[in-house]
Interface confidence: low
Amino acid sequence: FEIALPRESNITVLIKLGTPTLLAKPCYIVISKRHTTMLSIKPGERILFTFSCQSPENHFVIEIQKNIDCMSGPCPFGEVQLQPSTSLLPTLNRTFIWDVKAHKSIGLELQFSIPRLRQFGPGESCPDGVTYSISGRIDATVVRIGTFCSNGTVSRIKMQEGVKMALHLPWFHPRNVSGFSIANRSSIKRLCIIESVFEGEGSATLMSANYPEGFPEDELMTWQFVIPAHLRASVSFLNFNLSNCERKEERVEYYIPGSTTNPEVFKLEDKQPGNMAGNFNLSLQGCDQDAQNPGILRLQFQVLVQHPQNESNKIYVVDLSNERATSLTIEPRPVKQSRKFVPGCFVCLESRTCSTNLTLTSGSKHKISFLCDNLTRLWMNVEKNISCTDHRYCQRKSYSLQVPSDIFHLPVELHDFSWKLLVPKDRLSLVLVPAQKLQQHTHEKPCNTSFSYLVASAIPSQDLYFGSFCPGGSIEQIQVKQNISVTLRTFAPSFRQEASRQGLTVSFIPYFKEEGVFTVTPDTKSKVYLRTPNWDRGLPSLTSVSWNISVPRDQVACLTFFKERTGVVCQTGRAFMIIQEQRTRAEEIFSLDEDALPKPRFHHHSFWVNISNCSPASGKQLDLLFWVTLTPRTVDLT
């Protein structure tokens, strides 16, 4: 190899050992039969050398540094060449360094040709191994602006007082151009300005100078974003730290098109703006730090640019001003689909404060919009408390548990609407009456509607789930002893069409001691499957539930139990079942922990089934499934 450097080139070449490897065989640079491990070539020198091994790229690296002095004379602006040409250099990992010194009053602009640059953070690397490291100067201190790969959005970086630019090329990379040019500009009066240009949808992750170390004290750094008119941009902070300020406050400032309050000032811990149309600037301003305990200011953030959904241009009004004790949350649901660029999916309050989830509370009107490629990625959960504090006022009062129509106007699927129904302890109970009779969901007869009601105790210490119920069955009402939550859960988008089938009325009624009473009027056409609350986990200890089963005059009901025995083992007390004819009051009592369950039996009149649990032994719980079928009477037994 021969390297010759012209006298006026201001270029020095250094070949030195790279990161030590565990290669057994050493390798040397051979210059006129002399073996060495380092070679420095200065301007005006011409040196002939070779290597003592076949793969010098495993041992050595080459650094080519060009010093450009803009202090004493004119600056060589324009496209930067790779000198010496890469074809003249040995195939080693090579780093070209350009060190530009300039006056504080002169701005220097690095312009990057397409493909532009993409900043990467600590622990990351570039797929093709080509990296740009860019540093600036504040007086004598070097400040790292960032490390970059190809294929990004960064098109220009403006600095003043000087630039140090390093281009690292792996030994196998054929590249022979620098990919950037230098231009002079007027003073920028800040550390640097980074311009990021988006041609279409995409995202860019950017970092404050010196990241992950601290941003220089009391400095200002600006990012300018160029966004196509038809797209929207959102900013989210991925990581930040605040230093200990003695004077002034660390902040970010936005210049946003169309804003009447430019610059818009945000704290780093604030939710950052989203859904922005057009170009905008973001600046990071440091403070005067406490000399004793400065801490560090650092920021890593992402700008996400994507197509607005039709819905993004719409403002939806969610009027909760007449609601009480209600909260509505729009949030992402976990999704299977994945691809390289996953657009963000945001919900925006007042079109500007965008986040992946949003909770709206009662008492106000809220204006929301969406910035999301596919609104099925979001769903909505609503919670509403209906409580009674004064039993004299509430008794016999009724409330309709109906999803407000406002919610159907939103372009997001409703997942859960939960009503928490709270009553004064030992004073009142509750009765749920559905608009359409309900079916209890069982393995034997699952619900196939687009929604169900999940009824569970809302007493923290009580683990009691009454079951899942959907329209189209035989349950006319459900009475419960104390606080419960009723959750309308949707299973299909067709819920909007079936919404008319929803509707429960809750009434506060005089207190009773049983955990639950189900009123059932079987249908002549099908089996009614019923099961005890807390299926699979067992009816809670010492809990009692009843079913009031109506038998029409012209029918006979057949009551059948799923198993021969319950399998319950009582630690204390007894578990029993009472079947009582309502007309004659005749009753039969079965010991559930001892007796076999009754064989299928016929009832000509309405009857009660009451089940009371003992304190069961662990793993020997009480779970009971039974069904009722109606058949026409053949003989009138009245």
């Epitope: 976990p334 999704v335 299977k336 689909q337």
Partner: antibody, heavy 119, light 107 residues
Framework: QVQLVQSGSELKKPGASVKVSCKAS????????MHWVRQAPGQGLEWMGW????????TYADDFKGRFVLSLDTSVSTAYLQISSLKAEDTAVYYC????????????WGQGTLVTVSS | EIVLTQSPATLSLSPGERATLSCRAS??????LHWYQQKSGQSPRLLIK???QSISGIPARFSGSGSGSDFTLTISSVEPEDFAVYYC?????????FGQGTKLEIK
């Protein structure tokens, strides 16, 4: 009932390739995503990636990009994991598991396929 | 990626005792955490989904709690067949990750 049945154990030499199959029955393959999990001898579980059974698009965890290929043949309700340029450190039990759309937990698992790489 | 740290690595208990297994996430993952049991020579089995939701067919003695970054799997009274390795799994974002496992062994 739902079943995921995987192909039998494989003994391979370094540098060779192996293709593990996972046949789904008792449900429609394209209704659920298929995930692959690796467990090296005496070690924990590592999620390798998943395949979108509707589109056939695979997604890989970073450590499994390159030599690992996930594919499908919906006509025989079977998912495949192919590993090329096998190394000794690929010795492990490979599990397929069924994931749920909008609900990424693995409710059914194959019995596992032991792949041993040894010269 | 989300790193899940399980503790303790090994838990030695006698049948009938209460087992408490912990799983901590490196960042908040809401309730996107699932628990699996793996017995020697067998495939993992889903025990709890979404931090606390029970799974049909799993005994009631298994319960889960927690949200954010701290999660707990509780076995109210350990049965002989419960001695196994238990893994937590994050389903918050790709890549899905598993904890390193907690081995529940007989004392």
């Amino acid at each position: 009932q739902v079943q995921l049945v995987q192909s039998g154990s494989e003994l391979k030499k370094p540098g060779a390739s192996v293709k593990v199959s996972c046949k789904a029955s008792g449900y429609t393959l394209t209704d659920f995503s298929m995930h692959w999990v690796r467990q090296a001898p005496g070690q924990g579980l590592e999620w390798m990636g998943w395949i979108n059974t509707e589109t056939g698009a695979p997604t890989y965890a970073d450590d499994f990009k390159g030599r690992f290929v996930l594919s499908l043949d919906t006509s025989v309700s079977t998912a495949y994991l192919q590993i090329s340029s096998l190394k000794a450190e690929d010795t492990a039990v490979y599990y397929c598991s069924r994931g749920r759309d909008y609900d990424p937990h693995f409710d059914y698992w194959g019995q596992g396929t032991l792949v041993t790489v040894s010269s | 990626e989300i790193v899940l740290t399980q503790s303790p690595a090994t838990l030695s208990l006698s049948p009938g005792e209460r087992a408490t297994l912990s799983c901590r996430a490196s960042q908040s993952i809401s309730d996107f955490l699932h628990w699996y049991q793996q017995k020697s020579g067998q495939s993992p089995r889903l025990l709890i989904k979404y931090a606390s939701q029970s799974i049909s067919g799993i005994p009631a003695r298994f319960s889960g709690s927690g949200s954010g970054s701290d999660f707990t799997l509780t076995i109210s009274s350990v049965e002989p067949e419960d001695f196994a390795v238990y893994y937590c799994q994050s389903a918050h974002s790709f890549p899905y990750t598993f904890g390193q496992g907690t081995k529940l062994e007989i004392k």
